[in-house]
Interface confidence: medium
Amino acid sequence: FERTRSLQDPCSNCPAGTFCDNNRNQICSPCPPNSFSSAGGQRTCDICRQCKGVFRTRKECSSTSNAECDCTPGFHCLGAGCSMCEQDCKQGQELTKKGCKDCCFGTFNDQKRGICRPWTNCSLDGKSVLVNGTKERDVVCGPSPADLSPGASSVTPPAPAREPGHSPQ
């Protein structure tokens, strides 16, 4: 006859938050401090993640779940489960291998992370530039020149200037 799993393996009865203690006749023992088991039937408890240095604790470790970290102010998460912290830059900048660098002319970044992106080309939509772009803000497109009432004028964008490229990344 087929024996049930619990008869085959007494450890399968140990719930999350405990481990099957071989040193104590496979009794279910609670996870020691700073450790956890998120599933039943485990023979060991896993060490809790420690949020140190640039990491800070978002969720404390419990006997059944690992701690969760995020990054201290001025940094943001990278990698699976916030495994790394990357520095924030200012608006109008992007992070390169050499640190934070200002956006090149004709590009902007309105966030503290992410990359500089080209200003919107208003003329592609048959519109005119209402407000010039900056390092921190995209241009604002207005009605097309044909839509403007007589005598109204639109702001013309300056001709794009070439700036020396940033070092990669």
């Epitope: 990278l78 990698g79 790394m84 390169t96 490229g165 990669p168 990344q169």
Partner: antibody
Framework: EVQLLESGGGLVQPGGSLRLSCAAS????????MSWVRQAPGKGLEWVAN????????YYGDSATGRFTISRDNSKNTLYLQMNSLRAEDTAVYYC???????????WGQGTLVTVSS | QSVLTQPPSASGTPGQRVTISCSGS????????VYWYQQLPGTAPKLLIY???QRPSGVPDRFSGSKSGTSASLAISGLRSEDEADYYC???????????FGGGTKLTVL
């Protein structure tokens, strides 16, 4: 979950061409530099090339300059490596890697094997 | 010949501390961050150390990185059998405008 899946490897004769692809998912592809790194059988890692988020800047290792072209299609979340004038020494596993802005490779594909032999 | 120089092999017994060196120049290690990768047989490399001495979560604190001038090193304390792998250092090189790797160090746990 971030996934990088390379394809296009195989057996090719010396002087031949091959185009590798890397399908990316689980992240905003257009926000990141992407790279190709290769590893010849029993040898170390060798950086091949990388490409800026919008494709406007491309950088190549010595072995790739003049023969390989890196490109990307952000609308398809796909990275490419066009390899021409292939030589026996180009035989390697080619990995696609997502380059974090701090300049490191945290996510790698599983690799695709390119064999150049007659 | 790799731009970054590593010893081809290193070894130690369980519990020991092992250090792997990586030597470069002012164009790479001297002016850019150093990264360390671990590669187990038949698998893609795994990031161990970023920005000279930062450890991604999930990497045991037995692994530590340091940098001084144009050299860097990876230290592994409390060596375990599962640490047996190839280890690579890497850095951006400003003169080559590219990423450079060390030749790799094969670590054997005796």
């Amino acid at each position: 979950e971030v996934q990088l899946l390379e394809s296009g490897g195989g057996l090719v004769q010396p002087g031949g061409s091959l185009r590798l692809s890397c399908a990316a998912s689980g992240f905003t592809f257009s926000d990141y530099y992407m790279s190709w790194v290769r590893q010849a059988p029993g040898k170390g890692l060798e950086w091949v090339a990388n490409i800026k988020q919008d494709g406007s800047e491309k950088y190549y290792g010595d072995s790739a300059t003049g023969r390989f072209t890196i490109s990307r299609d952000n609308s398809k979340n796909t990275l490419y490596l066009q390899m021409n004038s292939l030589r026996a020494e180009d035989t390697a596993v080619y990995y696609c890697a997502k380059e974090e802005r701090i300049g490191t490779y945290y996510y790698w594909g599983q690799g695709t094997l390119v064999t150049v032999s007659s | 010949q790799s731009v970054l120089t590593q010893p081809p092999s290193a070894s130690g017994t369980p519990g020991q501390r092992v250090t792997i060196s990586c030597s470069g120049s002012s164009f790479n290690i001297g002016s850019n961050y150093v990264y360390w990768y671990q590669q187990l047989p038949g698998t893609a490399p795994k990031l161990l150390i970023y920005k000279n001495n930062q450890r991604p979560s999930g990497v045991p604190d037995r692994f530590s990185g340091s940098k001084s001038g144009t050299s860097a090193s990876l230290a592994i304390s409390g060596l375990r059998s599962e640490d047996e792998a190839d280890y690579y250092c890497a850095a951006w090189d400003d003169s080559l405008n590219g990423q450079v790797f060390g030749g790799g160090t094969k670590l054997t746990v005796l």
